[in-house]
Amino acid sequence: VPEKSVRWCAVSEHEATKCQSFRDHMKSVLPSNGPSVACVKKASHLDCIRAIAANEADAVTLDAGLVYDAYLAPNNLKPVVAEFYGSKEDPQTFYYAVAVVKKDSDFQMNQLRGRKSCHTGLGRSAGWNIPIGLLYCDLPEPRKPLEKAVANFFSGSCVPCADGTDFPQLCQLCPGCGCSTLNQYFSYSGAFKCLKDGAGDVAFVKHSTIFENLANKADRDQYELLCLDNTRKSVDEYKDCHLARVPSHTVVARSVGGKEDLIWELLNQAQEHFGKDKSKEFQLFSSPHGKDLLFKDSAHGFLKVPPRMDAKMYLGYEYITAIRNLREGTCPEAPTDECKPVKWCALSHHERLKCDEWSVNSAGKIECESAETTEDCIAKIMNGEADAMSLDGGFVYIAGMCGLVPVLAENYNTPNPNCENTAEEGYFAVAVVKSSSDLTWDNLKGKKSCHTAVGRTAGWNIPMGLLYSKINHCRFDEFFSEGCAPGSEKNSSLCKLCMGPSPNLCEPNNKEGYYGYTGAFRCLVEKGDVAFVKHQTVPQNTGGKNPDAWAKNLKEEDYELLCLDGSRKSVQEPANCHLARAPNHAVVARKDKADCVQTLLLDQQRMFGSSVTDCSSNFCLFESKTKDLLFRDDTVCLAKLHDRNTYEKYLGEEYVKAVTNLRKCSTSPLLEACTF
């Protein structure tokens, strides 16, 4: 097989015919050294998935349910290109499965038992698989056959295409359960009509169904959405209140050696030449031989799926939960309203050791999961492999953009017993230099810089945001002669100063000696000219407070702060000499786990928090000998957020604006994936 050939998998004679036409037309418009198409015919989409996994084909386009099959071992395929619908300016690659109710009704998602339900059709995504998958563990046992369990859960339903003889309750609202538009309650519009007519109490449809059926906002305002957290929202808040986000139609490839760049190059060229309204002789998104061949006829084009986005992230936690429940039919033994152990995400093996000790002391209420970077941890929380972790504000922003929510804040200044209920203002982000140097904020160009990590508040977002507004470009590695900013490209000058050791050089975790607040300060002590840290870093690592060899003889008076007005001040005066106020670190979790995480952590800190005085013979949650493992070592307590329970409210408008501006310079693959 030539290196630049993409073997497309076709699942019918008609698809194979279109594939050959696709191949021939691409040959006529692409240079001989460009990508080419080859066609492989298989009997089904599942056979195509297996063929790609076995390297007998390279690509196929799949519906969401099949993307799930493709992702499962041993297939291990990943999404590489998404079809989009709507306009190029506002491309839609996903739809949202929602539960619609009338505003004047008064029940929540956890009170659906005994209500009347309207569905688009048996086995369909938004109308059946997702809602029934998510409700699966609430269905009465035995849960097989599924239709019987659903019939016994609701007091009456309309499920088009169901067997009305065996399951009459499923056809109670639409006698016969007709499987076509002859049934007035069939499909999306039909299920909505079933609700509108008052036949049912809830309709399981797509987010767009309401807008397509009710052009008038006043009419739409008579309806609401049921959210998974047992609240309701208006119908236009579907992005924050849905059962699952469902990808429409996706090209998949192998996770390793999958030719994703070649596939994108091919499809990008194909949409340029043969996309909507581009060519008379061959159309990518239609065919005389049949409907939806190779690609959906309704598609308007393709978008490249960000490389960080694997199938779990693409399909989303809710969708995977729903499909897994339906397929595997397994439910936790514990009742769903009881808190299961919380899986904490630990960064690399140093945090993992502390987490393990916590787990032993918590009597198993805490479990541990590891990842090599903060972004990998956030991804694990998103997909349910982990539940929670404490993050710097810069990562609270990324986690928030990825759908996680802040749960508790680390407090550093408020003594107990008021600590738990106090909202602190934050800490100061400062620039530290040696007293012996002549540096000021205005002559940092060409100097050696030390950063906690890329994407963190005091070490990156605040100083680089201020720098960006001064230099108007993102080439920070050219502004400083060299530096250590863990998480930078390995060949960047901002990795040159890092200490490693080798395979971990410049990695954004504790294996890199210059990572974090203490690491950035160490970088200044040993190699750098300026360190961007929190205001407490110098006092915490001088005067013998840090016993490590590099720090034990350091004196606080040998360091000063740079002020934005060009002056310098003592490290004792951060309130009058700082770059900005930074939001405290905060614990984040998935929305569905937030309450359990909060309850458990408040309980854990009562046992292992700052009230424990002897950490040499007791486990201390907020202690790791200046290394800030799992939590900052100067944490006094974890505090309730009260109404600051979204990332925007928690971080504050000013900080969110600053980080959003800095996104022009973003090197965050996760953020790119979460905003796809």
């Epitope: 140093h350 050791l353 000790e357 002391n361 000998k625 290394k627």
Partner: nanobody, 117 residues
Amino acid sequence: QVQLVESGGGLVQPGGSLRLSCAASGSIASINTMAWYRQAPGQQRELVAGITRGGSTKYADSVKGRFTISRDNAKNTLYLQMNSLKPEDTAVYYCTDYSRGYYQDYWGQGTQVTVSS
């Protein structure tokens, strides 16, 4: 800080048993948490079992019901009783008391356990 020395490993058939010991050079009475870890070739080191001063224990899912951790403060020794051994239990086993902080790599020699027929 006490020094810890592991012993008791060896070659055993699937289904067999071993008892690992970890002898401390000083008193372990005031040590809060002690634990056994293991590392198989090419794998990360993982927690097998842990025990607190008060006797609270935690086990990895893969060993629950087969392994038992205990400590004898009078003998300054930590134990791991391993029953119904499986080939996947093959690894070097280490004990720790977490007392050196989490940052330094402070593992001892460990003791090799090989489960094979």
